[in-house]
Amino acid sequence: APVRSLHCTLRDAQLKSLVMSGPYELKALHLQGQDLEQQVVFSMSFVQGEESNDKIPVALGLKAKNLYLSCVLKDDKPTLQLESVDPKNYPKKKMEKRFVFNKIEINNKLEFESAQFPNWYISTSQAESMPVFLGGTRGGQDITDFTMQFVS
């Protein structure tokens, strides 16, 4: 089946938006007014993964770019990166595991757990303009809760 995708933006629980920071990094900061146009639009694809009644496997690409969020080990630590892919082959229903996140909805907030590294989540810092990263704790100082805004 052709992979089903939707376009959306994400904001963390502090209402920080996600923007590009260089060619292969995202950062989170508060945006207002016209600056909101800077935020990245994701193409969220619904893919095969270890789906459960509580978790929906998705891949997060950047709209109109051949870049996907992926999770890899760097210096023995699970790390979030933006990875370039061949646009002829992506998105696809059967994404490699490093591209897959388990979308978890709790109290109208979303978490994105790495399929490759269970219990590691897309995270932002409390501080402004810091990189979006893969964090191994939830409920601590770092933010793992997001809201999603649909984009037509």
Epitope: A1, P2, Q48, G49, E50, E51, S52, N53, D54, K55, K93, K94, M95, E96, K97, P118
Partner: antibody, heavy 122, light 107 residues
Framework: EVQLQESGPGLVKPSETLSLTCTVS????????VSWIRQPPGKGLEWIGL???????YYNSPLKSRLTISKDTSKSQVSLKLSSVTAADTAVYYC????????????????WGQGTLVTVSS | DIQMTQSPSSLSASVGDRVTITCQAS??????LNWYQQKPGKAPKLLIS???ILRPGVPSRFSGSGSGTDFTFTISSLQPEDFATYYC?????????FGQGTKLEIK
């Protein structure tokens, strides 16, 4: 060699809870998911639900409110509990190993146990 | 949920015959289609995965084809041990769903 073996009582009274165990060998429950499937006498196959290596579960909607699938990885056992059973739950119950080949063949089931017949009757 | 419509529900054939069973999905499932053989009192055995890939140890007289919504399972020359019930299974998305089965009987 991959093997799965179902066990449990062959007779359960209506309104009680059906409890089955699937004991596996030849693979680790932390690496592979296990599904449960049932087959009423003389009828076709119905997929019940599964538990992944992570412990996350997916339950088929018609049974979701009555179903619990859990596992003990150290004992290589997966358990199925189905509450408030009726005669319609009489079936041969199978457990089966998920293929778990990411980006290739994640959801199919490649090895099955021999099945155990559970009859719901008073 | 994806519905799988399998036909025929039963089939009489003789040793040496060529036999074809079809399975139709209610929506596009790419090649995520499996074929199982079940003999009386036994568990189903996976013969073909991903629509056309023969599992190790399965005789080459069994074959599968198709993609999208329409799939075919063929036994090129029936052997006595092939008389059984055959099921298709879609493994595209949850819940996994089976066809109703095809009982292959000796004519």
């Amino acid at each position: 060699e991959v093997q799965l073996q179902e066990s449990g009582p062959g007779l359960v009274k209506p309104s009680e809870t059906l409890s089955l165990t699937c004991t596996v060998s030849g693979f680790s429950l932390s690496d592979y998911g296990v599904s449960w499937i049932r087959q009423p006498p003389g009828k076709g196959l119905e997929w019940i639900g599964l538990i992944w290596g992570s412990g996350d579960t997916y339950y088929n909607s018609p049974l979701k409110s009555r179903l619990t699938i859990s596992k003990d990885t150290s004992k290589s056992q997966v358990s199925l509990k189905l509450s408030s059973v009726t005669a319609a739950d009489t079936a041969v119950y199978y457990c089966a190993k998920q293929t778990n080949l990411w980006a290739y063949d994640l959801y199919s089931m490649d090895y099955w146990g021999q099945g155990t017949l559970v009859t719901v009757s008073s | 949920d994806i519905q799988m419509t399998q036909s025929p529900s039963s089939l009489s054939a003789s040793v040496g015959d060529r036999v074809t069973i079809t399975c139709q999905a209610s929506q596009d499932i790419d090649d995520d289609l499996n074929w199982y053989q079940q003999k009386p009192g036994k568990a189903p055995k996976l013969l073909i995965s991903l629509a056309s890939i023969l599992r190790p140890g399965v005789p080459s007289r069994f074959s599968g084809s198709g993609s999208g919504t329409d799939f075919t399972f063929t036994i090129s020359s029936l052997q006595p041990e092939d008389f059984a019930t055959y099921y298709c299974l879609q493994s595209d998305s949850f819940p996994l769903t089976f066809g109703q089965g095809t009982k292959l009987e000796i004519k």
